[in-house]
């Protein structure tokens, strides 16, 4: 891949906007410069570059100065002011507000439920494979393998608590040491951040919204990746997490506590258990090398069972096979021992859709994966629409000021830490960092929360999920208490260490700059978002996993040159932007590299070729399909969701209607109206006050 996505004309000036330059707050690119230059030569050309057909909005008639895309949009009020309304209007508006609130809560409920079902779907599709990752004996000696297993398993089961509980049970039964478990926990931390990144993809319809949402989601990814990048080598060298947590566990005489309160699950479980119920013990059993578990289905069939424990006499080849020396004897013919046998009697079947279908796990998982993604997407779109209509004018101003404004001087620095506490508290309430960060993503997208504010909230969410784990550990049975508590504390201190690395000093807040860079790239080339997801959460971990299986020599042989190249590119990039004079003329920009190595344009052409077939057949019957269509073919009018096929053909023939860029509109709703996406609403019926 390119050392930097668009480095055709790298300038020493750090203020110049480069696509993907994570470190900058970009200004608008100079279009004349861009269009009067080909990618492979530096000679100016008079030919005007045609706008690509895959661009979402035709950027003709664009003003020379465009606002910073990271500035929050002004959500202007198109409705009548409250004071200007008559009594009937006020009552109507009040009930409209109540209706919207109910709808918002309803969609929010199904959004959270769909996240739960999505997790179940992933477990059905990849749970057994995830369990088998754990049964790899090399985890003990190879922390890098442990890390990628943590990532892959959590991505496959869409739940860090599931992968963490497998690790806990393996440590409890001495199949894994705490030392070997720490990299897996770090990996689980990374894996859990995929959920909100998937949620961000659902906001692909609007470029500016997608830019913010995707950056807001990936700030979590970058924080986790960067923390691991620094803290894994530190842990391998010093074992500081293991030592600190061991001291804590040993210094306290913990008594078994109560289970962490399931606040959100209480509300969502009644619905989700009607869809599907899983026997999550199966994944753990596979991880523990239980051969019988490999043939078991994850779909729970029997919910009410009676377990009868009895002792039976069984023959053993020799006394060495006895359950205990005192429970061994002979009848003169064979050696006997007593074995505890648990007879499971099925009493009542579970009450969920798939209970009587007897479909394979993969089939159930695939069905649920598609349905949950559709519901997730639908709910997200509706949440964004409702929030878009509610958060206007005064309401928006108040909310945005409350959330994004810092404390007065000299306490401004405290605001972020309060946000961390809020994030931790909210996550503790909802019992899931995925739910919290996924709920945050659309708010970032529509511009209610800035990325700068979302960052500490996300960090707090990381802390919140570990406090839940600590509480759960304290409720563990005696034999598992020690190991589960130590692992939960490792998770906690890892996140605390990460925050200390990437938050207190504004200069070190690299995840924000990197996320913004990725947001810029993904807004321009939307396929890159999917590409990023596949690369970082699947390909890199799978490659490392494969190389680790081949042996540490192969891993080092491939890994060292790759790491060296990355470091070299980063150093060069740093020198180019900070002090290019120290570099030879040739190295002052990236033009010495072939175009495909320094720009995403050639890759974009390839992707466009592949998705070209979709462009003509991109008929969207609903908004949900429309979002998927936008992501696939990047077609200009697909988000109008009307007679898509004909529209596209017309669009290809000639685009002579000047349309403003959506970024230049003050109101998201207005910008979509101008593009013909939503009908302009009658201002008389528009209501903003709740």
């Amino acid at each position: 891949m390119a050392p930097w996505p668009e480095l055709g004309d790298a300038q020493p000036n750090p203020d110049k906007y480069l696509e993907g330059a994570a470190g900058q707050q970009p200004t608008a690119p100079d279009k004349s410069k861009e269009t009067n230059k080909t990618d492979n030569t530096e000679a100016p050309v008079t030919k005007i570059e045609l706008l690509p057909s895959y661009s979402t909005a035709t950027l003709i008639d664009e003003p020379t100065e465009v606002d910073d895309p990271w500035n929050l949009p002004t959500l202007q009020d198109s409705g009548i002011k409250w004071s200007e309304r008559d009594t009937k209007g006020k009552i109507l508006c009040f009930f409209q507000g109540i209706g919207r609130l109910i709808l918002l809560l309803g969609f929010l409920y199904f959004f959270v439920c769909s996240l739960d079902i999505l997790s179940s779907a992933f477990q059905l599709v990849g749970g057994k494979m995830a369990g088998q990752f754990f049964s790899n004996s090399s985890i003990m000696s190879n922390p890098l393998l442990g890390l990628v297993i943590g990532v892959l398993v959590t991505v496959l089961v869409q739940s860090s608590s599931t992968s963490t509980s497998i690790v806990v049970s393996m440590v409890s039964s001495s199949l894994l040491t705490v030392r070997a478990a720490i990299p897996i926990i770090m990996g689980a931390n990374i894996g859990t951040s995929i959920t909100n990144t998937i949620v961000a993809l659902m906001q692909v319809g609007d470029r500016s919204e997608f830019r913010r949402a995707f950056a807001g989601a990936t700030v979590h990814d970058f924080f986790n990746w960067l923390s691991v990048l620094v803290l894994l080598p530190v842990e391998v060298a010093t074992h500081y997490l293991e030592i600190i947590t061991q001291l804590i566990v040993e210094s306290f005489h913990f008594k078994n506590g109560e289970d962490a309160p399931d606040l959100l699950k209480v509300i969502t479980k009644p619905f989700t258990k009607l869809i599907v119920q899983l026997d999550k013990k199966v994944i753990s059993q596979i991880a523990m090398n239980d051969e019988k578990a490999k043939n078991k289905s994850l779909v729970k069939i029997w919910c009410k069972t009676f377990t009868n424990k009895t002792q039976i006499n069984v023959t053993v080849p020799s006394t060495a096979n006895c359950t205990s020396p005192s429970l061994c004897w002979t009848d003169g013919i064979q050696n006997w021992t007593m074995k505890n046998v648990t007879y499971k009697e099925n009493i009542a079947k579970c009450q969920h859709i798939f209970v009587n279908f007897h479909l394979p796990d993969l089939a159930v998982g695939t069905i649920l994966l598609i349905l949950s993604l559709l519901v997730l997407c639908g709910c997200l779109i509706m949440i964004v629409k409702i929030l878009g209509s509610v958060l206007k004018g005064q309401v928006a101003t108040v909310i945005k000021k409350t959330i994004n404004t810092d404390f007065p001087f000299p306490f401004a620095w405290l605001t972020g830490y309060l946000a961390i506490l809020v994030g931790a508290g909210m996550t503790f309430i909802v019992q899931s960092s995925s739910v919290f960060t996924s709920a945050l993503t659309p708010l970032i997208g529509i511009g209610v929360i800035t990325i700068e504010r979302a960052y500490p909230l996300t960090l707090g969410s990381n802390i919140g999920t570990t406090t839940t784990a600590i509480l759960a550990a304290l409720a563990s049975p005696g034999n598992a208490l020690r190991s589960s508590l130590q692992i939960a504390l490792c998770h906690f201190f890892f996140n605390i260490s990460g925050i200390l690395l990437w938050y207190p000093i504004p200069f070190t807040r690299l995840p924000i700059r990197m996320a913004k860079g990725l947001g810029n790239i993904s807004a321009k080339y939307r396929w890159f978002a999917v590409f990023y997801l596949i690369i970082f959460f699947f390909l890199i971990p799978l490659t490392v996993f494969g190389l680790s299986l081949a042996g540490w020599r192969v891993l080092v042989g491939v890994g060292v040159p790759v790491v060296f190249i990355i470091i070299l590119v980063l150093c060069l990039r740093l020198l180019q932007s900070r002090c290019p004079r120290v570099l030879p003329k040739k190295l002052q920009n990236w033009n010495f590299l072939p175009l495909w190595m320094r720009s995403l344009k050639p890759w974009d052409a390839v992707v466009s070729k592949f998705t070209g077939c979709f462009q003509m057949r991109c008929c969207c019957c609903c908004r949900v399909c429309c979002r998927a269509c936008c992501l696939l073919c990047d077609c200009p009018k697909c988000c109008r969701c009307s007679k898509c096929c004909e529209d596209l053909e017309e669009a290809q023939e000639g685009q002579d209607v000047p349309v403003k860029a959506p970024e230049t509109f003050d109101n998201i709703t207005i910008s979509r109206e101008a593009q013909g996406e939503v009908p302009a609403s009658d201002s008389k019926t528009e209501c903003t006050a709740l």
Partner: antibody, heavy 121, light 107 residues
Framework: EVQLVESGGGWVQPGGSLRLSCAAS????????MYWVRQAPGKGLEYVSG????????YYVDSVKGRFTISRDNSKNLLYVHMGSLKPEDMAMYYC??????????????WGQGTLVTVSS | DIQMTQSPSSLSASIGDRVTITCRAS??????LNWYQQKPGKAPKVLIY???SLQSGVPSRFIGSGSGTDFTLTISSLQPEDFATYYC?????????FGQGTRLEIK
């Protein structure tokens, strides 16, 4: 009253064979494991063989394995041991003993009066 | 195979005496040890099973104890009919093995 009566003992040349029988009465024969225990003159007790209540599984001490065969006829309440390739060291008093029921520790709660087997040339 | 070692090999005692016979196993056998009494020209008779349980019809002066590898048979007050040879037997694993016996004689 539980009674076990052994028969079939006598003099035999080395390499010869002999079949001992044990007639049981006074208890449900088919419910008990049965054993053969021997005692060489002036020596201690030595376990020889055992057979399960249904006759399907049996055990032989290493020194007699492949030469002795234990069997039972639950319909006639009889226990047998067929001794082949007899050696001088097989010369002993052979006792038939009753064990507990299946799967309980081997306790020889009732013994026969014994039958003497003499192996000499 | 589990070796059973009895001590002493023989002992002399008077009527009314308290007599203790010990039996040691080459490995732990839990409590799966039985004691037998054999009088000259007669078949053995079970006295104690699973280390300490008294067989029905056996006088209560016979007391069995021990677990693991060390076991004892105690005759609290020796009676004339108690002069015989005593054997210990393990029923922990096949093959079943007996001790070499302890001959109890009148002093």
């Amino acid at each position: 009253e539980v009674q076990l009566v052994e028969s079939g003992g006598g003099w035999v040349q080395p390499g010869g064979s002999l079949r001992l029988s044990c007639a049981a009465s006074g208890f449900t024969f088919s419910s008990h494991i049965m054993y053969w225990v021997r005692q060489a003159p002036g020596k201690g007790l030595e376990y020889v063989s055992g057979i399960s209540s249904n006759g399907l599984s049996s055990y032989y001490v290493d020194s007699v394995k492949g030469r002795f065969t234990i069997s039972r006829d639950n319909s006639k309440n009889l226990l047998y041991v067929h001794m082949g390739s007899l050696k001088p060291e097989d010369m002993a008093m052979y006792y038939c003993a009753r064990g507990g029921r299946d799967r309980v520790p081997a306790v020889f709660d009732y013994w026969g009066q014994g039958t003497l087997v003499t192996v000499s040339s | 195979d589990i070796q059973m070692t009895q001590s002493p090999s023989s002992l002399s005692a008077s009527i009314g005496d308290r007599v203790t016979i010990t039996c040691r196993a080459s490995q732990s056998i839990g409590t799966f040890l039985n004691w037998y009494q054999q009088k000259p020209g007669k078949a053995p008779k079970v006295l104690i099973y699973v280390a300490s349980s008294l067989q029905s019809g056996v006088p209560s002066r016979f007391i069995g104890s021990g677990s693991g590898t060390d076991f004892t048979l105690t005759i609290s007050s020796l009676q004339p009919e108690d002069f015989a040879t005593y054997y210990c037997q393990q029923s922990y694993s096949v093959p079943i093995t007996f001790g070499q016996g302890t001959r109890l004689e009148i002093k």
